[in-house]
């Protein structure tokens, strides 16, 4: 059974990756921002049933073309570069999915925008952490 | 190999509509957006807009806006695209193209041989 | 829309010489420009991609350089090969849009 403090930490590492999913989601966003219209172009995959830690497997998955949207914006809307941002988001979803367990990620059929894609993880955060507060 | 190869030469009547068609090879169809280039005759080069295999989903430019079509079948890998109300300075080589890299917007890296399209009563 | 500005239209050159094409945005376009030669006949072919990258299997006296509204597309050494319709194309925004085209000749 998980203890107190295990979910006090996993509560944490979700808000910490929420936080840095609505900064992305912030920037793209931003009016300022000139390359939306090319952002909007790029495809993301979304997974047909996101619920527990294990389909964070899902996020993983697409945290590459991730960077490549963001590479387009040339961190003028980021506080990060993509690829240190990148890599902070893959560090807090391995510690959460944990590494031991091997999941398949099932995507739905429809891709989504990027808008899309970061607005289905924020809930996805989101949900979770409302059920372990 | 990457290969994009296009229907023949089309001569057409003012007003009527021309499909053209870009069967494409060597790699994952449904993951690269494929582009439209016009060329007129000595003319240079004109983007017209684009499709990606995966879902369908279209961008044109608004020159053309409600007189092209782009559409494509997964089941053959095919692209086509279709323009309607010919007329004369529709006349030129249409090019299909390949994005450079998958998901996304980028330029161009493999052609089709070009289709002639020639408007004339 | 981007505008672009490409210049010169044409241009005559030796064997051997150095040549240079220059292509002005209307906006700011980070370096999300792209070049293209095009021979008689023949479909576009790409030369050199965002953030001034060669291509691979792309002779290496083809370069460019630029950021912003500015680039420049240069032929360190031109060769009878060489001669062609040569385009920039931005690649930063859509509608996605070409230059004017510079035609290559050998003097």
């Known amino acids: 059974a998980p203890t107190s403090s295990s979910t006090k930490k996993t509560q944490l590492q979700l808000e910490h990756l929420l936080l840095d999913l609505q900064m992305i989601l912030n920037g793209i966003n931003n009016y300022k921002n000139p390359k939306l219209t090319r952002m909007l172009t790029f495809k993301f995959y979304m997974p047909k049933k996101a619920t527990e830690l294990k389909h964070l497997q899902c996020l993983e998955e697409e945290l590459k073309p991730l960077e490549e949207v963001l590479n387009l914006a040339q961190s003028k809307n980021f506080h990060l570069r993509p690829r240190d941002l990148i890599s902070n988001i893959n560090v807090i979803v391995l510690e959460l999915k944990g590494s031991e367990t091997t999941f398949m990620c099932e995507y739905a059929d429809e891709t989504a925008t990027i808008v899309e894609f970061l607005n289905r993880w924020i809930t996805f955060c989101q949900s979770i952490i409302s059920t372990l507060t | 190999e990457v290969q994009l190869v296009q229907s023949g030469a089309e001569v057409k009547k003012p007003g009527a509509s021309v499909k053209v068609s870009c069967k494409a090879s060597?790699?994952?169809?449904?993951?690269?957006?494929i582009q439209w280039v016009k060329q007129a005759p000595g003319q240079g080069l004109e983007w017209m807009g684009a499709i990606y295999p995966g879902d369908g989903d279209t961008r044109y430019i608004q020159n053309f806006k409600g007189r092209v079509t782009m559409t494509r079948d997964t089941s053959t890998s095919t692209v086509y695209m279709e323009l309607s109300s010919l007329r004369s300075e529709d006349t030129a080589v249409y090019y299909c193209?390949?994005?450079?890299?998958?998901?996304?917007?980028?330029?161009?890296?493999?052609w089709g041989q070009g289709t002639l399209v020639t408007v004339s009563s | 829309d981007i505008q672009m500005t490409q210049s010169p239209s044409s241009l005559s050159a030796s064997v051997g010489d150095r040549v240079t094409i220059t292509c002005i945005t209307s906006?700011?376009?980070?370096?999300?420009m792209n070049w293209y030669q095009q021979k008689p006949g023949k479909a576009p072919k790409l030369l050199i991609y965002e953030g001034n990258t060669l291509r691979p299997g792309v002779p290496s006296r083809f370069s460019s350089s630029g950021s912003g509204t500015d680039f420049t597309f240069t032929i360190s050494s031109l060769q009878p090969e060489d001669i062609a319709t040569y385009y920039c194309l931005q690649s930063d925004n859509l509608p996605y849009t070409f230059g004017g085209g510079t035609k290559l000749e050998i003097k």
């Open positions: 193209a390949r994005s450079l890299a998958t998901r996304g917007f980028y330029a161009m890296d493999y």
């Open positions: 906006t700011d376009i980070d370096d999300d």
């Open positions: 060597g790699y994952t169809f449904t993951t690269y957006w």
